[in-house]
Interface confidence: low
């Protein structure tokens, strides 16, 4: 058993049929010595008396809020949550496996630049009685500070018969050094509580590996005289790290016909313009990637050829 | 020559070669998400790798103030990785083809380090860790880890030289 926060405790249980469970001793936080009784949740049934209560925690029916009273007055509470371990593996019932970039990916994180700011998100089908708490640090053995906000519900989607809820959190490294070569990964830890079930999820990454620039901005076409060619120009996204002479991007320019089956013409360039042939009913798209480190491409910015 | 301690680095040459290094480092080990190398216990390789740290003056402000602090660290790293790529980790089984990206990477690391090295002057560089994996699979894993680390190192070096070429060239 360990304390998650004040008056909230997590009991770690090996979860299998007829498991012996865990013996837990609760102590009433009071100077009083006698006349103390214990109850669980809303029930008025007295579970025991005395300053301590010893219980055997085996299942969710044994978890909940234990309260000690004296003469009708509440003295203190202890909320017990369960953390299940099945076949040596901690349960992951609350969050959905996103399976990208690999199986057992519950948390996904992205950064728009090297400022030390990043966003993580996760998915669940649970709609109520759900709380999340997020902590993060640079490195684990000698952690350096990363400050995370509160996790918020950021999207709701219908997937078949199910509703899916996306939660996200923004974090900022306290002393970020955008130009340095990271040697210690960022660690993100999410505590998830659904009713009386506790689970924790972790992710470890370098900012450089989760970089995904915003799409290029101000995408414009300029027809070239007496030619089917156009000059496409664009700018670095506002959110990208500066100066651009240091934090450089590379770009992919694509000409795509109306039909997905039509051949795509692609040009790669480090410049912020390119000359391409504009076909009727086609569209021109541009996306960006860090020039020197192959992290994710941005989403496409597009304009029609007409 | 882009000389640590010298006053006029050959920024454009260094930029071109460092960008080539980035391309080679990724073609030598393109896998990004398929193998989480950090899970394999990195201690023996990464502890001694000369990372480009916050205090090395490789940020735009530090380069403007004076690029020599940064050039030293880059030079030190290039020599370090050049030695690693020439070691038993890469020359042992499973053997690499003579024209593999790793061979080109090794040659380019040497080329850039020589651009940064004043003739007849040999800077002290830290020793490479004594790593001699006994099994081919261990060697393979170590190669991946070293190449992943090198990708990060050369990315910073390439940014430095690109910025230098754009803003610090005479």
């Amino acid at each position: 058993i360990w304390e998650l926060k004040k008056d909230v405790y997590v009991v770690e249980l090996d979860w299998y049929p007829d498991a012996p469970g865990e013996m837990v001793v609760l102590t009433c936080d009071t100077p009083e010595e006698d006349g103390i009784t214990w109850t669980l949740d809303q029930s008025s049934e007295v579970l025991g008396s005395g300053k301590t209560l010893t219980i055997q925690v085996k299942e969710f029916g044994d978890a909940g809020q234990y309260t000690c009273h004296k003469g009708g007055e509440v003295l203190s509470h202890s909320l017990l949550l369960l953390h299940k371990k099945e076949d040596g593996i901690w349960s992951t019932d609350i969050l959905k496996d996103q399976k990208e970039p690999k199986n057992k990916t519950f948390l996904r994180c992205e950064a728009k630049n090297y400022s030390g700011r990043f966003t993580c998100w996760w998915l669940t089908t649970i709609s109520t009685d759900l709380t999340f708490s997020v902590k993060s640090s640079r490195g684990s053995s000698d952690p350096q500070g990363v400050t995370c906000g509160a996790a918020t519900l950021s999207a709701e989607r219908v997937r078949g018969d199910n509703k899916e809820y996306e939660y996200s959190v923004e974090c900022q490294e306290d002393s970020a050094c955008p130009a340095a070569e990271e040697s210690l990964p960022i660690e993100v830890m999410v505590d998830a509580v659904h009713k009386l079930k506790y689970e924790n999820y972790t992710s470890s990454f370098f900012i450089r590996d989760i970089i995904k620039p915003d799409p290029p901005k101000n995408l414009q076409l300029k027809p070239l005289k007496n030619s089917r060619q156009v000059e496409v120009s664009w700018e670095y996204p506002d959110t990208w790290s500066t100066p651009h002479s240091y934090f450089s991007l590379t770009f992919c320019v694509q000409v795509q016909g109306k039909s997905k089956r039509e051949k795509k013409d692609r040009v790669f360039t480090d410049k912020t313009s390119a000359t391409v042939i504009c076909r009727k009913n086609a569209s021109i798209s541009v996306r960006a990637q860090d020039r020197y480190y192959s992290s994710s491409w941005s989403e496409w910015a597009s304009v029609p050829c007409s | 020559r882009a000389v640590p301690g010298g006053s006029s680095p050959a920024w454009t040459q260094c930029q071109q070669l460092s960008q080539k290094l980035c391309t080679l480092a990724w073609s030598a080990h393109p896998l990004v998400g398929h193998m989480d190398l950090r899970e394999e216990g990195d201690e023996e390789t990464t502890n001694d790798v000369p990372h480009i740290q916050c205090g090395d003056g490789c940020d735009p402000q530090g380069l403007r103030d004076n690029s020599q602090f940064c050039l030293q660290r880059i030079h030190q790293g290039l020599i370090f990785y050049e030695k690693l790529l020439g070691s038993d980790i890469f020359t042992g089984e499973p053997s690499l083809l003579p024209d593999s990206p790793v061979a080109q990477l090794h040659a380019s690391l040497l080329g850039l380090s020589q651009l940064l090295q004043p003739e007849g002057h040999h800077w002290e560089t830290q020793q490479i860790p004594s790593l001699s994996p006994s099994q081919p699979w261990q060697r393979l894993l170590l190669r991946f880890k070293i190449l992943r680390s090198l990708q990060a190192f050369v990315a910073v070096a390439a940014r430095v030289f690109a910025h230098g070429a754009a803003t610090l060239s005479p």
Epitope: Q144, G145, D174, S175, C177, A180 | V3, P4, G5, G6, S7, Q53, C54, G55, N66, Q68, Q72, Q76, P118, H121, W123, E124, T125
Partner: antibody, heavy 117, light 111 residues
């Protein structure tokens, strides 16, 4: 043998000027930075500033900016620390030291500057 | 007032082990900057003892070792000898204009 040899002890009056030197030998002087460090009687080390002899680029600690001038002449492998108007509080031992991969790996023997009326 | 804080003095008997701490902040040691240690024997110039947190220049006995954790660093001396009696200073880079900062120094007495 790599060494830095500093000029001899100086006794000066307040308001006088002074230039002390630090000559490097046994290595390529231009390829290493030279830093200056002050140690007041019975006190600790204080970093004053640093110079790259190859291009005479200097950087000063804010505490010493405007109080001293650091210069170098790479043709004679010598760095200098100078005051235009000494104060009694400038009484101290002044060390020059070489910087490269290893910070301040070689030190001069020190120059004792005494300022007294 | 030094930017890096060291204990003014430490002492130990011959053969013993002593450690000297050096505490900085998020703008110097905590920013990932290396820590270096210098030894100053009485009446002599300082000498580089440890650089880059834990590396020893050639000629420095392996009785001297350095480590760094978070915003602080420490120097350990094992098998204390009478000739180790000296002042010891830590130094680091720092954010802002100062560039180099020293600790206030620690006087080591061998009893």
């Amino acid at each position: 043998e790599v060494q830095l040899v500093q000029s001899g002890a100086e006794v000066k009056k307040p308001g006088e000027s002074l230039k002390i030197s630090c000559k490097g030998s046994g290595y390529s002087f231009s390829n290493y930075w030279i830093g200056w460090v002050r140690q007041m009687p019975g006190k600790g080390l204080e970093w004053m500033g640093i110079i790259d002899p190859s291009n005479s680029y200097t950087r000063y600690s804010p505490s010493f900016q405007g109080q001293v001038t650091i210069s170098a002449d790479k043709s004679i492998s010598t760095a200098y620390l100078q005051w235009s108007s000494l104060k009694a509080s400038d009484t101290a031992m002044y060390y020059c030291a070489r910087w490269y991969y290893k910070p301040f790996d070689v030190w001069g023997q020190g120059t004792l500057v005494t300022v007294s009326s | 007032q030094s930017v890096l804080t060291q204990p003014p003095s430490v002492s130990g008997a011959p053969g013993q082990r002593v450690t000297i701490s050096c505490t900085g902040s998020s703008s110097n040691i905590g920013s990932g900057y290396d820590v270096h240690w210098y030894q100053q024997l009485p009446g002599t110039a300082p000498k580089l003892l440890i650089y880059g947190n834990s590396k020893r220049p050639s000629g420095v006995p392996d009785r001297f070792s350095g480590s760094k954790s978070g915003t602080s660093a420490s120097l350990a001396i094992t098998g204390l000898q009478s000739e180790d009696e000296a002042d010891y200073y830590c130094a680091s880079w720092t954010d802002g204009l100062s560039l180099v900062v020293f600790g206030g120094g620690t006087k080591l007495t061998v009893l």
